[in-house]
Interface confidence: low
């Protein structure tokens, strides 16, 4: 038999200890939140908030401007000064809870933990390719804010998620805040609200619609808002909350909340339980039917998918899919599965399940005993009755009240447990050619860029590298500018190319040339690299013969 070269084991064809240096910025304190802006005249910026300060960076992470956002009561606080002469409330540090772009103006809106959670609007002032912030406007009108009714109290110190939607000439802020009894009593933020930014930038219009955890449940029932996004006709919030109102705090699970993006109303507020599981190929004896549950969402991102993954998910290429990283939760017993799993929920399918849930609740014949749910927000009732009523009302429609859909949406880990001990703390998904790539940050300060494919029994890495030596967890917020993603870890912001930081971690020519085309890898004498790194011959088509 003819002699053949021995095969190089797959794991030996790559080295994830290879060091990559990516551009970074030291913010001078723990990065709290971050957002990017790309204008239509090639101007762009990265906005980075730390305690008491907001940095404006260029796309190259060079500092353009810095603004003092606290401490409240300090004469050096530049945002506080926009509210006129104080005092405006208790003094103290400002932790930025909300940093979002208002696309219509355009402007940056920041909301902090101080000054009753009020927000500041910073008009964007393009100067060449750089962006500066104009003097801030204080989004607070003292005369129409009271402790029990405060349209301008937006951010909760326990965490707030905001998505901004343009409706006609107005900008609406879809706001979701975590509450407890103390926060609810101090400056009355709401759990979920839709607030219209006043045209004169003096705050938010009074009389806004809102849902709040009922006072009797505030102590035991806390909702963490993990992510929010807008796609199609809806705004979505993702939450981690107790599975039961009566057993709260108890076991946690994940829900998707859907709100209309075309109507600033909460009558069509819907919730759906998201169920993510790890289902090993061979089920161990005693392992749960349907797979091991991973009920707690850590991070999420929605993105259109490439052709390959779309085929595996039985959806059309380019359709929007919600990706979530889930963990098992504290009370899940001894873990035999991976630390993190990733599940994919096509948005169209989520919408259909919600619409079907409305149909079950509101279309006759209604299944007896079907509850409307959301008893932490509203009085208990059975379908099709409105909350708190024991019979349908002739003047009101069943569909015009919040509803928890009675079925959950169950998916299994896309990675088949292959993330193993990796603890994922950040996620951003992109479509590159016909491939869908998950860009993940980890608890030990690494970046994993992995092709999303369901059918493989190994991970298709674009890269797996350490951001630095600090080993600090990569934070939840990830932003994109052009062909780069911005991750934060500790007090640093890092710029990571979507195509990966390089090719040097591929050790063999065969492995190098099998890398995805978008990575731009080629064989360069005795190493894998990109063409500009190779002074000599660079080959993408075939490998030299092994001697």
């Amino acid at each position: 038999k003819e002699w053949q070269c021995p095969r190089t084991p797959y794991a030996a064809s790559r080295d994830f200890n290879v060091k990559y240096m990516v551009p970074s910025f030291s913010a001078g304190g723990l990065v709290q939140t971050m957002v990017t802006y790309q204008g239509d005249k090639n101007e762009s910026a990265v906005f980075v908030a730390i305690r008491n300060r907001l940095h404006v960076l260029g796309p190259d992470l060079k500092s353009v401007q810095s603004l003092a956002t606290g401490p409240a009561g300090d004469p050096g606080c530049q945002t506080c000064a926009a509210c006129g002469p104080g005092p405006h409330g208790p003094s103290g540090d400002t932790d930025t809870k909300v940093l979002v772009l208002e696309p219509a103006l355009p402007a940056l809106v920041s909301c902090g933990s101080s000054l009753q959670g009020r927000c500041f609007l910073h008009d964007l002032d393009p100067q060449g390719t750089a962006v500066h912030l104009a003097a801030p406007a204080c989004l607070f009108s003292a005369h129409h804010n009271r402790p029990d009714d405060c349209p301008d109290c937006v951010a909760s110190p326990l965490g707030t998620r905001v998505t901004v939607v343009e409706q006609g000439q107005a900008s609406y802020f879809y706001v979701a805040s975590s509450l407890d009894a103390a926060v609810a009593a101090s400056f009355s933020p709401r759990s979920v609200s839709i607030r219209r930014l006043k045209a004169d930038a003096s705050g938010f219009a009074p009389g806004f619609v809102a849902l709040s955890v009922l006072p009797k449940h505030l102590v035991s029932y806390s909702i963490e808002y993990v992510h929010s996004f807008h796609t199609g006709a809806f705004v979505y919030f993702l939450t981690v909350q107790p599975a039961s109102v009566t057993d709260a705090p108890g076991a946690l699970h994940t829900r998707l909340a859907r709100l209309s993006a075309t109507e600033p109303e909460l009558g069509d507020y819907r919730e759906l339980v998201l169920d993510c599981r790890f289902a090993p190929k061979r089920r161990r004896r005693g392992a749960p039917e349907g797979g091991q549950p991973y009920p707690v969402l850590r991070v999420a991102h929605s993105a259109p998918v490439g052709a390959q993954l779309a085929t595996e998910l039985s959806i059309a290429e380019g359709q929007e899919v919600l990706f979530g990283v889930f963990v098992a939760g504290k009370d899940s017993g001894p873990g035999v599965g991976p630390n993190s799993v990733v599940c994919a929920f096509p948005i169209d399918l989520l919408d259909t399940l919600i619409d079907e849930g409305v149909e079950r609740c509101c279309e006759s014949p209604v299944h007896p005993g079907l509850r409307r749910g959301l008893d932490f927000f509203q009085s208990p009732s059975f379908c099709p009755n409105p909350p708190g009523l024991e019979a349908p009302s002739p003047n009101t429609s069943c569909r015009h009240f919040p509803l928890l859909v009675s079925s959950s949406f169950s998916r299994v880990d896309l990675f088949n447990g292959l993330l193993g001990t990796v603890e994922v703390t950040a996620l951003y998904v992109t479509r590159l050619d016909n491939v869908t790539v998950a860009h993940m940050g980890t608890a030990d300060g690494r970046i994993l860029q992995v092709e999303l494919a369901r059918s493989l029994n190994y991970l298709l890495y674009v890269s797996n590298f350490s951001l630095g030596d600090s080993g600090q967890p990569v934070q939840r917020d990830v932003s994109r500018l052009g062909d780069h993603l911005f991750f934060a870890s500790g007090d640093q912001v890092f710029q990571v190319p979507i195509q990966g930081p390089g090719c040097r971690h591929f050790l063999t020519c065969g492995r190098c040339l099998r890398a995805q085309r978008f990575m731009g890898c080629g064989w360069c004498g005795n190493m894998c690299g990109r063409q500009k790194e190779c002074p000599g011959s660079w080959q993408q088509d075939h490998c030299p013969p092994k001697l």
Epitope: A233, F234, S260, E263, L349, D351, T352, V358, S397, R399
Partner: antibody, heavy 123, light 112 residues
């Protein structure tokens, strides 16, 4: 019982705007459902034009581009069609109809129709 | 847009005899929720259309059970087991799975 009644001019000149009204009785246009306009050309071809939902959001057939809009007057329980820059090709019988309550689509077909109003576009 | 093709365009029948109309769509009408939004409408002479069948096979209230609908994916059929005089008119299929909603060209059911 739910009833829909179309009304408007039977004759419109080319390049002018066509405005039609659909008056609904037996149901409130804010209570549920999508309220649609459909037209039938000579020769019987039917075309779905668009809807306004119970909440006031609208959805239009892309083939009508930006010439077409639907509005409503909830106090009169009416919804309206406006078609701008009409040509002879817009001559048809125009129907209003009630659809399902889905956000994206008019739901499972059209259960209730008006009797239709014939519109002729001619100089 | 989804094209709905009906055959035949005219169907001549005798009262009391069965009739069958076919409707084919240019793409599958199966929606992601497992439902197929295919409807059949009848337009009697001088009247507005009236829905007979929705979700492929569900009869509207008041529609006689001599009407039945069947099919899946892209191929659908409306059957009348015994034609009566009141059944004469033009039958249309309508899809509401995909945006925009589209109708078939119609099948005229007339007396032989």
């Amino acid at each position: 019982d739910v009833q829909l009644q179309e009304s408007g001019p039977g004759l419109v000149k080319p390049s002018q705007s066509l405005s039609l009204t659909c008056t609904v009785t037996g149901d409130s246009i804010t209570s549920d459902y999508a309220w649609n306009w459909i037209r039938q050309f000579p020769g019987n071809k039917l075309e779905w034009m668009g809807y306004i939902s119970y909440s006031g959001s609208t959805s239009y057939n892309p083939s009508l581009k930006s010439r077409f809009s639907i509005t409503r007057d909830t106090s009169k329980n009416q919804f309206f069609l406006q078609l701008n820059s009409v040509t002879t090709e817009d001559s048809a019988t125009y129907y209003c109809a009630r659809g399902g309550f889905y956000y994206r689509y008019a739901g499972p077909g059209f259960a209730y129709w008006g009797q239709g109003t014939l519109v002729t576009v001619s100089a | 847009d989804v094209v709905m093709t009906q055959t035949p365009l005219t169907l001549s029948v005798t009262i009391g005899q069965p009739a069958s109309i076919s409707c084919k769509s240019s793409q599958s009408l199966l929606y992601t929720n497992g439902k197929t939004y295919l409807n059949w409408l009848l337009q009697r002479p001088g009247q507005s259309p009236k829905r007979l069948i929705y979700l492929v096979s569900k009869l509207d209230s008041g529609v006689p059970d001599r009407f039945s609908g069947s099919g899946s994916g892209t191929d659908f059929t409306l059957k009348i087991s015994r034609v009566e005089a009141e059944d004469l008119g033009v039958y249309y299929c309508l899809q509401s799975t995909h945006f925009p909603l589209t109708f078939g060209a119609g099948t005229k059911l007339e007396l032989k």
